[in-house]
């Protein structure tokens, strides 16, 4: 089973219900919507930090990206078969210390979610 770590920094639309409802689809880094193409939000929104307790697969733990970083979630649609219950989500929360986060200033105040079934593009191409 592959898992991908996903990120977002400035999600204006995050609320607690969307965290539980949308955990089945990979969340997008909201950095991605403040781009040169003119899309996206600019404000930072504080939200609790959490990460799943399951380890990432070896393919994801590269020397260039060994650290756990965080993400907020903005998913309007969900895939029922992939969605976890609030109970399952709660079981997977882990609170990290500041030293463990090692986050960039631009990437603070965010959550981390990992995608249970999302194989990388390279793996899908094999």
């Amino acid at each position: 089973e592959s898992r991908a770590e996903l990120t977002s920094d400035k999600d204006m639309y995050l609320d607690n219900s969307s965290i539980e409802e949308a955990s089945g689809v990979y969340p997008i880094d909201d950095d991605d919507y403040a781009s040169a193409s003119g899309s996206g939000a600019d404000e930072d929104v504080e939200s609790p930090e959490l990460t799943t307790s399951r380890p990432l697969p070896k393919i994801l733990l590269t020397s260039a990206a060994p650290k756990v970083e965080t993400t907020t979630l903005n998913i309007q649609n969900k895939i029922p078969a992939q969605t976890k219950s609030p109970e399952e989500t709660d079981k997977e929360k882990v609170h990290l210390s500041d030293s463990e986060r090692k986050m960039d200033p631009a990437e603070e105040d965010t959550n981390v979610y990992t995608e249970k079934h999302s194989d990388s593009l390279f793996k899908r191409t094999e």
């Epitope: 996903l6 990979y26 880094d29 950095d31 991605d32 590269t62 990206a65 649609n77 999302s118 194989d119």
Partner: antibody, heavy 122, light 112 residues
């Protein structure tokens, strides 16, 4: 704010080489896969290449395979596209784009640069 | 390679009216994890493309809810419930299932 700025484009003769750069800011560059996509004048989008966050994995579009090489310097927050044996049909605006998933290349392109124009002509 | 085919090529729409764009792939984009690796992008005049929809039906952050994506396998649809003037541009579908990533030819949405 995420920013991607391409540079290095210009007029080049067929058969010659050119190196494009993409400088980024506003996110942890070393955590994201990066792509190059091009658009010939008045035409649609064509994917060119992808490189994983750690530079261990690379893939190319059929039309550039063997001629173009994608690299990155994570210490300088810069993505490169080395183009050799250039052809007139390589004339296009070249965009760099950031993958949307950290530490894992999803294939979805969340942030795009403004593009740099490469013209291959004698 | 996966071939992506979009229709129509051009789509004149009256503001406030709905619009629909079709995208077909030469092979199924439904992966074993249950996700369809199909994205929609909009390139507004003079701008870089921007991501609208990913994994077939999920709106990217900041994208108005009048945009929706649907479909599975080889047939996908982007719908705009009520077109606004700012929606003009060229819409592209793209398969992200495997490399080489491939785009549809584009659909130019214009205001009547």
């Amino acid at each position: 704010e995420v920013q991607l700025v391409e540079s290095g484009g210009g007029l080049v003769q067929p058969g010659r080489s050119l190196r494009l750069s993409c400088g980024v800011s506003g996110f942890t560059f070393s955590s994201f896969g990066m792509h190059w996509v091009r658009q010939a004048p008045g035409k649609g989008l064509e994917w060119v290449a992808v490189i994983s966050n750690d530079a261990l994995h690379k893939n190319y579009g059929d039309s550039v395979k063997g001629r173009f090489t994608v690299t990155r310097d994570n210490s300088r927050n810069t993505l490169f596209l080395q183009m050799t044996s250039l052809r007139p049909e390589d004339t296009a605006v070249y965009y760099c784009a950031k993958d949307v998933v950290r530490g894992h290349t999803s294939g979805s392109l969340g942030s795009w640069g403004q593009g740099t124009l490469v013209t291959v002509s004698s | 390679d996966v071939v992506m085919t979009q229709s129509p090529l051009s789509l004149p729409v009256t503001p406030g009216e709905p619009a629909s764009i079709s995208c077909r792939s030469s092979q199924s984009l439904l992966y074993s994890n249950g996700y369809n690796y199909l994205d929609w992008y909009l390139q507004k005049p003079g701008q870089s493309p921007q991501l609208l929809i990913y994994l077939g039906s999920n709106r990217a952050s900041g994208v108005p809810d009048r945009f929706s994506g649907s479909g599975s396998g080889t047939d996908f649809t982007l719908k705009i419930s009520r077109v606004e003037a700012e929606d003009v541009g060229v819409y592209y579908c793209m398969q992200a299932l495997q490399t080489p990533l491939t785009f549809g030819g584009g659909t130019k949405l214009e205001i009547k």
